[in-house]
Amino acid sequence: QPSVSPGEPSPPSIHPGKSDLIVRVGDEIRLLCTDPGFVKWTFEILDETNENKQNEWITEKAEATNTGKYTCTNKHGLSNSIYVFVRDPAKLFLVDRSLYGKEDNDTLVRCPLTDPEVTNYSLKGCQGKPLPKDLRFIPDPKAGIMIKSVKRAYHRLCLHCSVDQEGGSVLSEKFILKVRPAFKAVPVVSVSKASYLLREGEEFTVTCTIKDVSSSVYSTWKRENSQTKLQEKYNSWHHGDFNYERQATLTISSARVNDSGVFMCYANNTFGSANVTTTLEVVD
């Protein structure tokens, strides 16, 4: 328990005075927060929170979902915490199966344990398949398992959190990793035709094709030296993972002489931008 020099506000005191507590499913959780300036208890698991304004937190029949961090806070904003594991052989993992990873970043598989005394807390591939050889992870019983430096190749990887218990493996529910690619090159842009010669009243239609690793690429048709918003229509396709194509079609239904000029198809992503132009000449 914390000790502070006299005169300074001190953090609350929690009974039982330990950082971690293990209780069995069905048993009572009884936590006492002692502080003259007690404000609240906060319970947190899988980043969700609940509050209790009573200084004694009592859960008569503990369930696996009562596993988590219990924090007592006083009026000075000082706090103290205890982590409670509710050991339930039927529910070894608490899970949130939403799993997204940004390429080259770490991502957390949220499967905290309800029993810290199991062994070999790790990730396993679904249906007995091995994990990618370069997949590295760091287990944390209170948070889950952190996958380090997500690769594009891990997209739609099927995973289980796993522990060993009484000689066998116990698997969590399935997680499907969805990888958002990092932009490592500018978009590829092309235009259906580099120049057009039309008579007044004819329809002008030009298509720009934008290719990139994801639909997050931004694209627009612009008229050079003009801020006017051009009307464009889109079609898009995913040709498998990380191979996205968009066609942006610009149409002027009845071209006029003053529509003549240079039109630019511009695309950008977080790596950089690219553009391609087409020239329209309208004669009367």
Epitope: E44, D47, E48, T49, N50, V95, D96, R97, S98, Y100, K102, N105, C126, Q127, R156, C158, K174, I176, R180, S215, S216, H238
Partner: antibody, heavy 117, light 111 residues
Amino acid sequence: QVQLQQPGAELVKPGASVKMSCKASGYTFTSYNMHWVKQTPGQGLEWIGVIYSGNGDTSYNQKFKGKATLTADKSSSTAYMQINSLTSEDSAVYYCARERDTRFGNWGQGTLVTVSA
Amino acid sequence: NIVLTQSPASLAVSLGLRATISCRASESVDIYGNSFMHWYQQKPGQPPKLLIYLASNLESGVPARFSGSGSRTDFTLTIDPVEADDAATYYCQQNNEDPYTFGGGTKLEIK
């Protein structure tokens, strides 16, 4: 305990822009993705896009790219959506929804945006 | 984009009987046996409320009268028996692939 608070209504003029808020409580704001959904009588429910937890990356439905911009303020646990160049077609109810365990488990009450001169 | 087609568009069912709503996806929403299909209920002036997630899992607090089934492209929401409070519009939604999409909705009326 989880709550998503949205303003009830916004009245805006054509051509203007509107920035609506979604204030989150009851969970760690930076740990969950926030989605935005548009609802009109004609088009039903349409997914606008998502702002991902942690780093604030966004992904948009192509239909709303350039029309909607999603941002978040971690310090106030608030997600925002700005819609620009408003027309009558943007009149709708806009919801924020928190993604939890693969689904939209929590929704705001919605903001009714009316575009009128 | 994955298109979700709900049928019927509207449905009138007598109190105590069974209501069945179908949702067909233009392509599979399954990955490794997980169907990324969810069902929501919406009443006028309220946001959608989650009923069923991952095709067949009952959301906490939702009555067991609601059930979901199906895989790949064909999904069903069943309410059995129907109660007066179930009058609402029901939507299916997929989040297997961007952009996430919703069905057009089925309006349930209780006779």
